[in-house]
């Protein structure tokens, strides 16, 4: 570490005087402090001199004395306070910027020691600090403003008791920069536009930071339109705002417009799309299959996207039947906008009713006209089966009726013994019958088929099941003859077990 | 309809000064940049400069830099160029043009000729 | 500053004929952000104020017919005038809108034969 000469931490001369700094260190070294007149600086190897036969109060200050070949970067100082009578304060900037936030040294240093005691910080023309300042003062380095404000931008002077008057320094402007987090907030306003051709349109590009030094613009298609700025200043944030007033669009002003602000710390941008459309438009759709199929005691939402400008006049669901006069209920019929022009319309049906089967029809106007969407609801069943023993054509037959949607299809089966049902190991023969008559087929109503299995001999302690399945579930019928040997009776002379 | 309506014709004498007014209907005020233009016989149309009409700021040709000064009165939707120091130089009819958001004049007052002359 | 510059300074033409006008630039008018050309043509009659014909170098302004036709880029443009008409008569100026100063050329003066 270099060692100076006089070894004192401070040293206190009178205007006039002179003073010489010797520094030695194992190398070479180097001296550093205010920038004042008068010094001469001679320098032999290991040691350097700074000398002044004259000093002045501007020569006040701190000099250092560094080794730049020493590794570990040590340095030695001694404080010069050179005290003249009719100059208290030596002020080494004139103007300071610092961030919020951040501590101001202003440094004006003090040429006597002994005025310590005495001095102050004020604002210019003898108006006191803005409430809140905190400061502290350091006779070597001047008046500290900790934490500073971008309010605390004034200017300052360094005040000491002198003889029982005060005497100033020349001023210090503080300039407190705002920390500017990021490029300048925006927003583009509306985040969509559809206009008729002729109507009007405005399109507002904002931007706002706590810095006023930022651009903005709004450009459409890539080109940057000639838009006068407004400007304003609240909540502590600059605004700029261009508004783009179209009083009659047409096609030319359709497309892609993108508002811009950047400022030092880089660039912000949002879009927006606008079109223009020759008249008013009603678009109904669904993502979902207008033929729905359900199975009965379930529930269904049917929902319905509307496009359309300008916006509805008028909505409902209506339920177009077959089986009654119901109407849908309002409480199940919910609307949410997706956002100025799109729509989502539900329906809610939930533990649908046989008699809730057939059309609902979701009907929108706007000044584009009506429209419809009709949705076709067909209830899912699963079979239900029975079994009669009869004669056709002089033959025994056990006729099978079989109702359900979709339609189902027919198994017979013959087992041995007496049971409610068949099971694999009672299996005796089984047919299917892949073409059953359709008895009945209506639009929204259960299918019902019917399957004939001829028996020439019904065999008693046997049991013939109709089995009917679809892609709901199953249902079956097992008939069990209770006789005495007869091969063909008449039904009435039989029982039959569902 | 979207109108420049400029005061009238201005008779004056050399130094002395005039203020020629250019008053706007049918559109938003504030929302175009409001021109000036000069149109004499030996110069064709020259351009003297604009008027931010919301800030009142102002961008002007260097030639007319201290020769014109604009000014706005949002209220009545006017817009004034003032003339100083006036030579037989400054002769000239003056128009008032609206600058459309793509950069070209769309709506033109009809001019106010001014004479200088002793 | 920009310089403009027209020619021919005057032409007279017949009822039916086509006309040309040329104006140049001393640098470029195109913007290579949007690759526009920041040039407009305006049609000034007798005793009225400028009226604008053509924007964009080539973009017509609602309501002028489409016998005028403006074309070019970079720093030659040209006004097409296909089949002339006696209320053509005017002087034709060309503005840049590219930078300011905005600059005008010093006119092409149509007279009909």
């Known amino acids: 570490i270099p060692v100076i000469e006089p070894s004192v931490p401070e040293l206190v001369v009178k205007p006039g005087a002179t003073v010489t700094l010797r520094c030695v260190g194992n190398g070479s070294v180097e001296w550093d402090g205010p920038p004042s007149p008068h010094w001469t600086l001679y320098s032999d190897g290991s040691s350097s001199i700074l000398s002044t036969n004259n000093a002045t109060f501007q020569n006040t200050g701190t000099y250092r004395c560094t080794e730049p070949g020493d590794p570990l970067g040590g340095s030695a100082a001694i404080h010069l306070y050179v005290k003249d009578p009719a100059r208290p304060w030596n002020v080494l900037a004139q103007e300071v910027v610092v961030f919020e936030d951040q501590d101001a040294l202003l440094p004006c240093l003090l040429t006597d020691p002994v005025l310590e005691a005495g001095v102050s910080l004020v604002r210019v023309r003898g108006r006191p600090l803005m409430r809140h300042t905190n400061y502290s003062f350091s006779p070597w380095h001047g008046f500290t403003i900790h934490r500073a404000k971008f309010i605390q931008s004034q200017d300052y002077q360094c005040s000491a008791l002198m003889g029982g008057r005060k005497v100033m320094s020349i001023s210090i402007r503080l300039k407190v920069q705002k920390v500017i987090p990021g490029p300048p907030a925006l927003t583009l306003v509306p985040a969509e536009l559809v206009r008729i051709r002729g109507e009007a349109a405005q399109i507002v590009c904002s931007a706002s930071s706590v810095d006023v030094n930022f651009d903005v613009f709004l450009q459409h298609n890539n080109t940057k339109l000639a838009i006068p700025q407004q400007s304003d200043f609240h909540n502590n944030r600059y605004q700029k705002v261009l508004t783009l007033n179209l009083d009659q669009v047409d096609f030319q002003h359709a497309g892609n417009y993108s508002c811009v602000a950047s400022n030092v710390q880089g660039k912000h941008s949002t879009s927006m799309f606008f079109r223009v459309v020759e008249s008013a438009y009603l678009n109904l759709s669904s993502e979902q299959n207008l033929i729905q199929e359900v199975t009965v005691g379930e529930g269904l939402n049917l929902k319905v996207m509307v496009e359309a400008y300008p916006g509805l006049q008028g909505f409902n669901w209506t339920y177009l039947g077959p089986f009654s006069d119901h109407q849908p209920e309002p409480k199940l019929a919910n609307a949410t906008t997706k956002d100025t022009y799109r729509h989502t319309f539900t329906l809610s049906l939930p533990r649908l009713k046989p008699s809730e089967a057939g059309r609902y029809s979701f009907l929108a106007r706007n000044p584009g006209g009506w429209r419809a969407l009709t949705f076709e609801l067909t209830l899912r069943y699963p079979p239900e089966v029975s079994v009669i023993w009869t004669f056709i054509n002089g033959s025994g037959t056990l006729l099978c009726a079989a109702s359900g949607y979709p339609q189902p299809n027919v198994t017979w089966l013959q087992c041995s013994g007496h049971t409610d049902r068949c099971d694999e190991a009672q299996v005796l023969q089984v047919w299917d019958d892949p073409y059953p008559e359709v008895l009945s087929q209506e639009p929204f109503h259960k299918v019902t088929v019917q399957s004939l299995l001829t028996v020439e001999t019904l065999e008693h302690n046997q049991t013939y099941e109709c089995r009917a399945h679809n892609s709901v579930g199953s249902g079956s019928w097992a008939f069990i003859p209770i006789s005495a040997g007869a091969h063909t009776h008449p039904p009435d002379e039989f029982l039959f077990t569902p | 309809e979207v109108r420049l309506q400029q005061s009238g014709p201005e008779l004056v004498k050399p130094g002395a000064s005039v203020k020629i007014s250019c008053k706007a209907s049918?559109?938003?005020?504030?929302?175009?940049?409001m021109h000036w233009v000069k149109q004499s016989p030996e110069k064709s149309l020259e351009w003297i400069g604009e008027?931010?009409?919301?800030?009142?700021?102002?961008t002007y040709n260097q030639k007319f830099t201290g020769k014109a000064t604009l000014t706005v009165d949002k209220s009545s939707s006017t817009a004034y160029m003032q003339l100083t120091s006036l030579t037989s130089e400054d002769s000239a009819v003056y128009y008032c043009?609206?600058?459309?958001?793509?950069?070209?004049?769309?709506?033109w007052g009809a001019g106010t000729t001014v004479t200088v002359s002793s | 500053d920009i310089v403009m510059t027209q020619s021919p300074s005057s032409l007279a033409m017949s009822v039916g004929q086509k006309v040309t006008m040329s104006c140049k630039s001393s640098?470029?008018?195109?913007?290579?952000?949007?690759?526009?050309?920041?040039l407009a043509w305006y049609q000034q009659k007798p005793g009225q104020s400028p009226k604008l014909l053509v924007y964009?170098?080539?973009t017509r302004d609602s309501g002028v017919p489409d016998r005028f036709t403006g074309s070019g880029s970079g720093t030659d443009f040209t006004l097409t005038i296909t089949s002339v008409q006696t209320e053509d008569l005017a002087v034709y100026y060309c503005?840049?809108?590219?930078?300011?100063?905005?600059?005008f050329g010093s006119g092409t003066k149509l007279e009909i034969q």
């Open positions: 043009a609206r600058l459309n958001y793509y950069w070209y004049f769309d709506v």
């Open positions: 049918g559109y938003t005020f504030t929302g175009y940049y």
């Open positions: 008027i931010n009409p919301n800030t009142g700021s102002c």
């Open positions: 640098q470029t008018l195109l913007n290579s952000n949007d690759q526009k050309n920041y």
């Open positions: 964009f170098a080539s």
């Open positions: 503005q840049q809108d590219y930078s300011t100063p905005f600059t």
